[in-house]
Amino acid sequence: TVPPMVNVTRSEASEGNITVTCRASSFYPRNIILTWRQDGVSLSNDTQQWGDVLPDGNGTYQTWVATRICRGEEQRFTCYMEHSGNHSTHPVPS
């Protein structure tokens, strides 16, 4: 088992909004849960976009999940990752 490296980034979207993206990389096996939480509970699937789980060329995998949020509300969101029985949460950088 190779645990993922998780990185959260933010980028400008439309006025007053930002897109936050949670990337998991360099993990094996390929089964992973990557999702956003808002106010400590699950964010609905229809407000999240997932990338495919793809090989990264080193025998490991990468994927991502993104959502659009209002600027100033970053503190309400965390990215949750679960892989091979281990899990972690990751805040949006300010």
Epitope: D39, V41, E73, R76, E82, G85
Partner: antibody, heavy 119, light 107 residues
Framework: DVQLQGSGPGLVKPSQSLSLTCSVT???????YYWNWIRQFPGNKLEWM?????????NYNPSLKNRISITRDTSKNQFFLKLSSVTTEDTATYYC???DGRGAWFAYWAQGTLVTVSA | DIQMTQSPASLSASVGETVTITCRAS??????LAWYQQKQGKSPQLLVY???TLADGVPSRFSGSGSGTQYSLKINSLQPEDFGNYYC?????????FGAGTKVEIK
């Protein structure tokens, strides 16, 4: 370390409003986290009532309809529960509690405040 | 709303025994589950979150497991201080709801 302390009247008459205060020490309620009210009925059933967040937003249990209000006084580092039009069914031990944005589990609780609704 | 059904409602066990408490959610809660212990006259205390993670200071004889709609709390080698009420709580969505509780008594 953060501490929460609930307070308020132990007896409320039916049809009146129940008002409780949670005083927080060791952490500013505007910095982060979600500041909740939970009650436990006789017989031990637990019910989440709602929260006020670090930013001042609310989320309430729909079962309480329009009877509940959670507000705060940032200068005193306190948050408040107001439950209107109470009946004897609102007799319970009321807890204030905190969770963080990693997940809505309650790591910090105040001691309970028993509120009896009776004429 | 997601309903949480806990079983058994009560159990009697001796010190040193292993006990298991189960919690069933009315929908898939994807491991968004916490367990609490409550002693008589005290506030609930967090034991486990994210279905499997022990809270700070919780002894390793406690363990959480499960997935989907079915979850368990196991206590290995029950100690005198473990007697009390245990509750599960989901945090998949609002409103947050708790199980009705399991009372663990001394046999």
């Amino acid at each position: 370390d953060v501490q929460l302390q609930g307070s308020g009247p132990g007896l409320v008459k039916p049809s009146q409003s129940l008002s409780l205060t949670c005083s927080v020490t060791g952490y500013s309620i505007t910095n982060d986290y979600y500041w909740n009210w939970i009650r436990q009925f006789p017989g031990n059933k637990l019910e989440w009532m709602g929260f006020i967040s670090f930013g001042g937003s609310n989320n309430y249990n729909p079962s309480l309809k329009n009877r509940i209000s959670i507000t705060r006084d940032t200068s005193k580092n306190q948050f408040f529960l107001k439950l209107s039009s109470v009946t004897t069914e609102d007799t319970a031990t009321y807890y204030c509690a905190r969770y963080d944005g990693r997940g809505a589990w309650f790591a910090y609780w105040a001691q309970g405040t028993l509120v009896t609704v009776s004429a | 709303d997601i309903q949480m059904t806990q079983s058994p409602a009560s159990l009697s066990a001796s010190v040193g025994e292993t006990v298991t408490i189960t919690c069933r959610a009315s929908g898939n809660i994807h491991n968004y589950l916490a367990w609490y212990q409550q002693k008589q006259g005290k506030s609930p205390q967090l034991l486990v979150y994210d279905a499997i993670t022990l809270a700070d200071g919780v002894p390793s004889r406690f363990s959480g497991s499960g997935s989907g709609t079915q979850y368990s709390l196991k206590i290995n080698s029950l100690q005198p201080e473990d007697f009390g009420n245990y509750y599960c709580q989901h945090f998949w969505s609002f409103p947050l709801t708790f199980g009705a509780g399991t009372k663990v008594e001394i046999k």
